[in-house]
């Protein structure tokens, strides 16, 4: 997991490489400015959306090379003993709220699975990532609104749950969890884009995705 420093770094999508490049450009231009991640993500997403297949090519090549690197490194990687042991999770603890992207996936996954029954879970996720990535900020708004509402509810629920006191096994992880909460939330804005948004394999000639008509 995240604990093993020897574990190969996860492979990056073309969109993640693009965001990284944007971030580097931004840092060069404004070295002292702090980044508003949601604004930055929105700008990146809009810019990616209007890029041509040729412009995206550079990032797709980077992603292909990184995928090859990851696969090569994973072949020789041996996970440490006890890696699979899961830390105690209280079944009564409030569930973490879904992200806007996750809510979006719940809407469109049935269609993609229904029309492409042979697709692997990974390929369905990739298609959903492409779709989200090609969705304008205005169109994402209802999902983001709902995700924010659920996050707000979760924060209230988790506060109440913590106030009540937890089972001893869970208590140990709480201090650490509290400390890392702020850092985690800052990182999440970036991870949402990088982990959840896959690249768009744009073709020169568009095809119809829908093949469901009876």
């Amino acid at each position: 997991g995240k604990g093993d420093p020897k574990k190969p770094r996860g492979k990056m999508s073309s969109y993640a490489f693009f965001v990284q490049t944007c971030r580097e450009e931004h840092k060069k231009k404004h070295p002292d400015a702090s980044v508003n991640f949601s604004e930055f993500s929105k700008k990146c997403s809009e810019r990616w959306k209007t890029m041509s297949a040729k412009e995206k090519g550079k990032f797709e090549d980077m992603a292909k090379a990184d995928k090859a690197r990851y696969e090569r490194e994973m072949k020789t990687y041996i996970p440490p003993k006890g890696e699979t042991k899961k830390k105690f999770k209280d079944p009564n603890a409030p569930k973490r709220p879904p992200s806007a992207f996750f809510l979006f996936c719940s809407e469109y996954r049935p269609k993609i699975k229904g029309e492409h029954p042979g697709l692997s879970i990974g390929d369905v996720a990739k298609k959903l990532g492409e779709m989200w990535n090609n969705t304008a900020a205005d169109d994402k708004q209802p999902y983001e609104k709902k995700a924010a509402k659920l996050k707000e509810k979760y924060e209230k629920d988790i506060a109440a749950y913590r106030a009540k006191g937890k089972p001893d096994a869970a208590k140990k992880g709480v201090v650490k969890a509290e400390k890392s909460k702020k850092k985690k939330e800052e990182e999440e804005d970036e991870e949402d884009e990088e982990d959840e948004e896959e690249e768009e394999d744009e073709e020169d000639e568009e095809e119809e995705e829908d093949d469901d008509d009876e």
Partner: antibody, heavy 122, light 107 residues
Framework: EVQLLESGGGLVQPGGSLRLSCAAS????????MHWVRQAPGKGLEWVSR????????WYADSVKGRFTISRDNSKNTLYLQMNSLRAEDTAVYYC???????????????WGQGTLVTVSS | DIQMTQSPSSLSASVGDRVTITCRAS??????LNWYQQKPGTAPKVLIY???SLQSGVPSRFSGSGSGTDFTLTISSLQPEDFSTYYC?????????FGQGTKLEIK
């Protein structure tokens, strides 16, 4: 054959209400975004509203926000538009249409229903 | 909102003519642009989606091009059934917006 059939239009007084229905057939209704588009007599097309496949998420044109409500019943393959506080400027033919996506996730409207006329007049 | 401006608003042409209708977006929309044809008293019908892809069943005399802010619909050789009104529409964001339409009439 993919078909959309609107109903529920008619003459209504300003401030009144009307509920439009759109019956879908020939495709898996629950997979698709659905939209309402209207056309005032002798004028161009105006997008009105959109609803996500499950019905959980909705979008509206500013001109109808707070007055119109889009909904769907996937078990009945039917799309609805509840129109309240109607104004003279809402007079139009209302079309329901399906949002289709290309492999690059570009959306377009296909097919369209035949439309239902809503007249708001005293 | 993204404004879509079509030109010309109306156009007179003859059977066999080559006709071009243009559509301009108020901001860059990539290739998120569709073209529809509407005959009097009937619902619109999609001709071109994603700026240049021909909808199945639409004659090949219709073609679309452009990206960013400027788009064109071309009819290479007008047929009698092509005299109708044409609309462009952006699907880049919400609200979806249409051009005001171009009425194609017989000269």
């Amino acid at each position: 054959e993919v078909q959309l059939l609107e109903s529920g239009g008619g003459l209504v007084q300003p401030g009144g209400s009307l509920r439009l229905s759109c019956a879908a057939s020939g495709f898996t209704f629950s997979y698709y975004d659905m939209h309402w588009v209207r056309q005032a007599p002798g004028k161009g097309l105006e997008w009105v509203s959109r609803i996500s496949p499950s019905g959980g998420y909705t979008w509206y044109a500013d001109s109808v926000k707070g007055r119109f409500t889009i909904s769907r019943d996937n078990s009945k393959n039917t799309l609805y538009l509840q129109m309240n506080s109607l104004r003279a400027e809402d007079t139009a033919v209302y079309y329901c249409t399906r949002g289709r996506y290309t492999s690059g996730w570009h959306e377009y409207f296909d097919p369209w229903g035949q439309g239902t006329l809503v007249t708001v007049s005293s | 909102d993204i404004q879509m401006t079509q030109s010309p608003s109306s156009l007179s042409a003859s059977v066999g003519d080559r006709v071009t209708i243009t559509c301009r977006a108020s901001q860059s929309i990539g290739t998120y642009l569709n073209w529809y044809q509407q005959k009097p008293g009937t619902a619109p019908k999609v001709l071109i989606y994603a700026a240049s892809s021909l909808q199945s069943g639409v004659p090949s005399r219709f073609s679309g091009s452009g990206s960013g802010t400027d788009f064109t619909l071309t009819i290479s050789s007008l047929q009698p059934e092509d005299f109708s009104t044409y609309y462009c529409q952006q699907s880049y964001n919400t609200p979806r917006t249409f051009g005001q339409g171009t009425k194609l009439e017989i000269k």
